[in-house]
């Protein structure tokens, strides 16, 4: 394990809480599912469903679990070693350049264009010009036909977990 996830909010926690399991760091770092104590002598387990860490680390706090927003469904819960995986609800998608919210998929393509790609949790429907086959980008003008979009199947995590 050597990659890092995108930083999440820190989970405020009492590092000496009695219910948290302790172990010794290995070579000065703590394993996934743990964080390091302030004196560097202990690894303290993250709290299931509250916080997590995905890699060997010297975090003083585990990372706070993401809560799925309204308009999202939870595909998998937060564990001590993996963040929550959230996905946009059917008929909505999350763009790379605006990952903070799910946007409604278009219901159809502009005049002179045909649909070649369905609405998925991470992309809008895809439209191409009938003649040239070039993709349409930007806002939709008048809609010629209404096409029911089908949701995609693969999961789209709220934040990458390496």
């Amino acid at each position: 394990e050597s990659a890092l996830i995108t930083q999440q909010d820190l989970a405020p926690q009492q590092r000496a809480a009695p219910q948290q399991k302790r172990s010794s760091p290995s070579e000065g770092l703590c394993p996934p599912g743990h964080h390091i104590s302030e004196d560097g002598r202990d690894c303290i387990s993250c709290k299931y469903g509250q916080d997590y860490s995905t890699h060997w680390n010297d975090l003083l706090f585990c990372l706070r679990c993401t809560r799925c927003d309204s308009g999202e469904v939870e595909l998998s819960p937060c564990t001590t070693t993996r963040n929550t995986v959230c996905q946009c609800e059917e008929g909505t998608f999350r763009e790379e350049d605006s990952p903070e919210m799910c946007r409604k998929c278009r219901t159809g393509c502009p005049r002179g264009m045909v649909k070649v790609g369905d609405c998925t949790p991470w992309s809008d429907i895809e439209c191409v010009h009938k003649e040239s086959g070039t993709k349409h980008s930007g806002e939709v003008p008048a809609v010629e036909e209404t096409v029911t979009s089908s949701p995609g199947t693969p999961a789209s995590p709220c934040s990458l977990s390496g």
Partner: antibody, heavy 119, light 106 residues
Framework: EVQLVESGGGLVQPGGSLRLSCAAS????????MSWVRQAPGKGLEWVAT????????YYPDSVKGRFTISRDNAKNTLYLQMNSLRAEDTAVYYC????????????WGQGTLVTVSS | DIQMTQSPSSLSASVGDRVTITCKAS??????VAWYQQKPGKAPKLLIY???TRHTGVPSRFSGSGSGTDFTLTISSLQPEDFATYYC????????FGQGTKVEIK
Amino acid sequence: EVQLVESGGGLVQPGGSLRLSCAASGFTFSSYVMSWVRQAPGKGLEWVATISSGGSYTYYPDSVKGRFTISRDNAKNTLYLQMNSLRAEDTAVYYCARRGDSMITTDYWGQGTLVTVSS
Amino acid sequence: DIQMTQSPSSLSASVGDRVTITCKASQDVGTAVAWYQQKPGKAPKLLIYWASTRHTGVPSRFSGSGSGTDFTLTISSLQPEDFATYYCQQYSSYRTFGQGTKVEIK
């Protein structure tokens, strides 16, 4: 006296590779977690990579993940940073740094070595 | 990432002046903050860790305070060798630094 001396910097083209070294002395190198930190010209400091004392565990920020690899040779008291697929934004002075005892942060730094990525 | 916002970005002061530099974390980092001094072409030097603990050999005119999100580095009586750039750093979650404060001669 703790000493960290970096070497291996230079001019490299975008997409190219470079390997930095850091020779450590004055302390028991194999007992310490080590890191690389960089400083772009006129900019602030940015953490780049961390490796455990024995070299078994490493971690990186997303900005370099998959392109940079930190490693160490405890027999030679040397820390390395292998940098691949270099970009213009990787231009910086690269410092090797030691994590202190019981403080979980860097206590000693090297003088740095300049890496310039340009065509 | 946790952002560390340092202010001011630069300041002019005279020998003997009391200088205060502040750093604000974008979220609670407890007391996991360090302060470094850097002179041109030199390695950064650790001054303060755990927000208020002076590193070995650091003069007593340097002091740190704060917890949570607000932190301060104070130089009680500026000396000629103190003209440098100062950085705060949080180490609660990975490592992020402030943009630096350059202390110049007035």
